[in-house]
């Protein structure tokens, strides 16, 4: 199976350098990795082509670095795609303004079919305006200005695969660049099930690993490996066989790891927060 990892360094964009790094551990170079803008998730983002370069620190990796460019050029949804033997694996992620009026509770949220779900956005700026919520760019919900809570929520009592997508929140007087984004991933199967008919029982994935609905395999969080994610990697390492290393001075600080669906994005062990720097 492919080992593809997308590192979203600082998904909340300010005036600091920000990057995307897509790593394919041990792949041969004639199976190229691509990084692009995910217009399916967010149509109205910047259309300038990305300057994708080889990551010199790794054998098979591509990188996009924004050095203090205008945030409007960065704000949006992205993907990294790898192909092997005709099969494509795509990892999705997002970058948004640190100065957004709301911030998501998490960058991605993975739930099982039928789950009772609350998608949450934290109010950062207080304004005398209605709050509005969109899904994949289409309006779904508004909250009158005097009723906007500190935590703005979208409630889905029985999540279905069609509920999956990019949810965004902003004040009604705002725009794309003052919006907060979070991506809801809904597994095709109910909890602990996998297979075309969802009638196979998942292996119990440990350490917050996620059962893949098509293969029944555990997708392990960064920093864990093994069939059930039972083995902890050495400090500051990640990847299916723990061969990749975080090169930062503080290890995996500010590394938001995004893995193929249905996993989504998370921090390495020991880090938390939207930026994985807490």
């Amino acid at each position: 199976a492919m080992d593809l990892i997308l590192i979203n360094s600082l998904p909340l964009v300010s005036d600091a350098e920000t990057s995307l790094t897509c790593i394919a551990s041990g792949w041969r170079p004639h199976e190229p990795i691509t990084i692009g803008r995910d217009f399916e998730a967010l149509m109205n983002q910047h259309q300038d082509p990305l300057e994708v370069t080889q990551d010199v620190t790794r054998e098979w990796a591509k990188k996009v670095v924004w050095k203090r460019e205008k945030a409007s050029k960065i704000n949006g949804a992205y993907f990294c795609e790898g192909r092997v033997r005709g099969e494509a694996i795509r990892i999705r992620t997002m970058k948004m303004r640190q100065q957004a009026s709301f911030l998501p509770a998490t960058l991605t949220m993975t739930v099982d079919k039928g789950d009772n779900v609350n998608i949450s956005f934290k109010k950062v700026l207080i304004k005398e305006e209605d709050a509005v919520i969109y899904k994949n760019g289409s309006f779904i919900h508004s909250v009158p200005r005097h009723e906007v809570p500190d935590i703005l929520e979208v409630h889905l009592p029985h999540a279905q695969p069609q509920d999956a997508g990019v949810y965004s929140a902003r004040y009604i007087g705002g725009n794309l660049f003052t919006s907060a984004f979070t991506r809801l991933i809904v597994r095709r199967c109910e909890a602990q099930k996998w297979g075309p008919e969802c009638n196979h029982l998942c292996t119990a994935c440990m350490n917050n690993g996620v059962c893949h609905e098509d293969t029944g395999e555990c997708i392990c969080p960064p920093g864990f490996m093994g069939r059930t994610c039972e083995k902890a990697c050495e400090l500051h390492t990640f990847g299916r066989t723990c061969k990749e290393r975080c090169s930062g001075q503080e290890g995996c600080k500010s590394y938001v790891f995004c893995l193929p669906d249905p996993y989504g994005c998370s921090c390495a062990t020991g880090w938390k927060g939207l930026q994985c720097n807490e």
Epitope: N44, Q47, K70, S72, S142, I172, G174, N175, L176
Partner: antibody
Framework: EVQLVESGGGLVQPGGSLRLSCAAS????????MHWVRQAPGKGLEWVAG????????VYADSVKGRFTISRDNSKNTLYLQMNSLRAEDTAVYYC???????????????WGQGTLVTVSS | DIQMTQSPSSLSASVGDRVTITCRSS???????????LDWYQQKPGKAPKLLIY???NRASGVPSRFSGSGSGTDFTLTISSVQPEDFATYYC?????????FGQGTKVEIK
């Protein structure tokens, strides 16, 4: 200070051309759609043209379609209106206006320039 | 094109009066979500217009609470609850549902 400053207005003969500029400052210019609105002497407001934040969407009033061209240079924080085949009825104060949106949808113009007068007369 | 008709075309009021201006559109401005695609602007002689209300009833930043927008579909109202000396100006409604964006002909509010 957030401001828009128009320039390029003046007296021009019918059939002539003029290029208006609008210099933006105090806000992130390429986060927003921009518009031109005009007002003939003693008359009401008339929307002329609009352009989205990344120039991906451009729209015109029927009265200027084919004669006027709206454009923007985000690297210079400047909006333009190229006006060709000018007519007497194009005589007006031309305002540039900032939208609150990045796209040409749910528009509202929260910042306006002081206006530049275009007079078309022989 | 959507036609916008304001009434009255002018009115006289005293400081402290409640002033109501109406705007009617030739087709509904109510979008699929509950917002109406209508803005209100104030313009003083020799000055640029100023945004007061957007999406029917949302007050723009810094606009005093005495200004309010209401209505839905094709009939809209701008209300100044207690008119102040600085409010004497011309007011315009504008529809933003479809291009071309169109303004009403204006309502001039004068001192009685």
């Amino acid at each position: 200070e957030v401001q828009l400053v128009e320039s390029g207005g003046g007296l021009v003969q019918p059939g002539g051309s003029l290029r208006l500029s609008c210099a933006a400052s105090g806000f992130t210019f390429d986060d927003y759609a921009m518009h031109w609105v005009r007002q003939a002497p003693g008359k009401g407001l008339e929307w002329v043209a609009g352009i989205s934040w990344n120039s991906g969407s451009i729209v015109y009033a029927d009265s200027v379609k084919g004669r006027f061209t709206i454009s923007r240079d985000n690297s210079k924080n400047t909006l333009y209106l190229q006006m060709n085949s000018l007519r007497a009825e194009d005589t007006a104060v031309y305002y540039c206006a900032k939208d609150i949106r990045e796209q040409l949808v749910e528009d509202a113009f929260d910042i306006w320039g002081q206006g530049t007068l275009v007079t078309v007369s022989s | 094109d959507i036609q916008m008709t304001q009434s009255p075309s002018s009115l006289s009021a005293s400081v402290g009066d409640r002033v109501t201006i109406t705007c009617r559109s030739s087709q509904s401005l109510l979008h699929s979500h509950r917002y109406n695609y209508l803005d209100w602007y104030q313009q003083k002689p020799g000055k640029a217009p100023k945004l007061l209300i957007y999406l029917g009833s949302n007050r723009a930043s810094g606009v005093p609470s005495r200004f309010s927008g209401s209505g839905s579909g094709t009939d809209f109202t701008l209300t100044i609850s207690s008119v102040q000396p600085e409010d004497f100006a011309t007011y315009y409604c504008m529809q933003t549902l479809q291009t071309p964006l169109t303004f009403g002909q204006g309502t001039k509010v004068e001192i009685k």
